[in-house]
């Protein structure tokens, strides 16, 4: 796969993943009332990071925001924080990666700068994806713990004590937002990895030039007053000048063929 394709695909995959992270964060169905093996209610409860909702059999749905910060469980606060971190890093990653895309020309930005930006955006996407995955996983773990605790309470005879009125404990299970979050985090992570891989293809391979004295042979390279710096293609303002007229080459080839020069 060419560097441009890898970078472009990485960007698109990260973008989809990022959109998914935002969607998951905003969704109300992080946890939904467990309907299996439970007294069936005419009311369906579900909860998100920001509000809890109740849908009645009548179709009437009512949502209430969590209007307190101090009264909320620390784990919920942590999940919120992780998802917001994921979104913020994703936004920065997208902005950086737009400028880093090989197919977009911005001023006189050379490939080494684009490579650095691609790597930066890739790392940002990776951290964003991991942050979202951790956030969703922490919430899922919290649900599993609470689920088994309420199951234990249900069957430990709490409601069956002589003469006492039974109360039903609502159990919650995984909501759609968890699956959206896991997939979205995974896509953002994969997109970030692809950006990092693309960065390697964009990076000029300096090792081929270190401690090597070379001269351009007369028939290969036209004379430029700027000397070899101009003719090697690494000059700040000569990237797009056609230096060598020896057949069709891609921009990728331009960076990866130091053999166009005669080594001494």
């Amino acid at each position: 796969m060419s560097v441009t394709a890898c970078q472009g695909l990485g960007f698109v995959v990260s973008l989809i993943g990022f959109a998914g992270i935002i969607a998951a964060t905003c969704m109300d169905q992080w946890s939904t009332q467990d309907l299996y093996n439970n007294p069936v209610t005419a009311v369906f409860n579900y909860q998100g990071l920001w509000r809890s909702c109740v849908r009645e059999s009548s179709g009437f749905t009512e949502c209430r925001g969590y209007f307190t910060l101090l009264g909320l469980p620390a784990m919920l606060q942590a999940v919120r924080a992780l998802m917001i971190v994921g979104i913020v890093l994703g936004v920065i990653g997208i902005l950086v990666s737009i400028f880093a895309l090989k197919c977009i020309r911005i001023g006189s930005m050379d490939d080494s700068a684009k490579a650095k930006m691609t790597l930066t955006s890739g790392i940002l996407f990776i951290i964003s994806g991991i942050s979202a995955i951790i956030g969703v996983s922490v919430f899922a773990n919290m649900l599993v713990t609470n689920f088994w605790m309420s199951t234990a309470n249900m069957y430990s005879g709490m409601g069956g004590m002589g003469g006492m009125v039974q109360t039903v404990q609502t159990r919650y299970t995984f909501g759609a937002a968890l699956f959206v979050g896991w997939v979205a985090g995974g896509l953002t992570l994969i997109g970030g990895v692809m950006m990092c891989i693309a960065c390697r293809g964009l990076t000029p391979d300096d090792s081929n030039f270190k401690a090597v004295s070379y001269h351009a042979s007369g028939q290969n390279v036209a004379y430029r007053p700027g000397g070899f710096k101009a003719s090697t293609g690494f000059g700040s303002n000569t990237r797009n000048k056609k230096i060598y007229d020896g057949g069709a080459r891609t921009e990728d080839d331009e960076q990866s063929h130091p053999t166009k020069y005669d080594y001494v």
Partner: antibody, heavy 118, light 113 residues
Framework: EVRLQQSGPELVKPGASVKIPCKAS????????MDWVKQSHGKSLEWIGE????????IYNQKFKGKATLTVDKSSSTAYMELRSLTSEDTAVYYC???????????WGQGTLVTVSS | DIVMTQSPSSLTVTAGEKVTMSCKSS????????????LTWYQQKPGQPPKLLIY???TRESGVPDRFTGSGSGTDFTLTISSVQAEDLAVYYC?????????FGAGTKLEIK
């Protein structure tokens, strides 16, 4: 104005079946579930079941499973309840009722008296 | 199934009197999600279908006189008529609107002297 119009009284023989219609008007039929309630003479109310007119999904009281079948005809905005294998125990007034906030029933049909007698 | 127990089964009062009737459920009808109690009160006059009075245990249906008040939470609920009128002669039913199957109480018959 919301209206639920039920048919007149029915006299049926034991073992037979009867299908009671409930025609809704004054609101969008598919937006609200329709419930059915039984009231035997001088007795309390018994919930039979509920149907979602949008998708035909039903929830039945276990006691009436096999006895009552709830259906809808969206084109005519009519809900139906079919009662089969009728016995004298099934003699009662049957109401259709439209669900409302709090899963309560704000709108009721006038009731259909089903008398099972040979 | 949830059992709804109403008391008294009947009561006779004079016009203008205050009346309270009770309804107890075998399980809590309080939904933790919205902190609402899924209990409804109906009034049924002879030869008529039931009429909705109160839903969510305490929310009065529009058009219902304000002398009717619903209260209670969890398993114990009360319907209060602050000043009984002659037209209040009816049977009053409470209903569990939380658990399937939805269940009704046996009713409280209100008679006027």
């Amino acid at each position: 104005e919301v209206r639920l119009q039920q048919s007149g009284p029915e006299l049926v023989k034991p073992g037979a079946s009867v299908k009671i219609p409930c025609k809704a008007s004054g609101y969008k039929f598919t937006d609200y579930n329709m419930d059915w309630v039984k009231q035997s003479h001088g007795k309390s109310l018994e919930w039979i079941g509920e149907i979602n007119p949008n998708n035909g999904g039903t929830i039945y009281n276990q006691k009436f499973k096999g006895k009552a079948t709830l259906t809808v005809d969206k084109s005519s905005s009519t809900a139906y309840m079919e009662l089969r294998s009728l016995t004298s125990e099934d003699t009662a007034v049957y109401y259709c009722a439209r669900i409302y906030y709090g899963n309560s029933f704000a709108y009721w049909g006038q009731g259909t008296l089903v008398t099972v007698s040979s | 199934d949830i059992v709804m127990t109403q008391s008294p089964s009947s009561l006779t009062v004079t016009a203008g009197e205050k009346v309270t009737m009770s309804c107890k459920s075998s399980q809590s009808l309080l939904n933790s999600g919205n902190l609402k109690n899924y209990l409804t009160w109906y009034q049924q006059k002879p030869g008529q279908p039931p009429k909705l009075l109160i839903y969510w245990a305490s929310t009065r249906e529009s058009g219902v006189p304000d002398r009717f008040t619903g209260s209670g939470s969890g398993t114990d609920f009360t319907l209060t008529i602050s000043s009984v009128q002659a037209e209040d002669l009816a049977v009053y039913y409470c209903q569990n609107d939380y658990f399937y199957p939805l269940t009704f109480g046996a009713g409280t018959k209100l008679e006027i002297k």
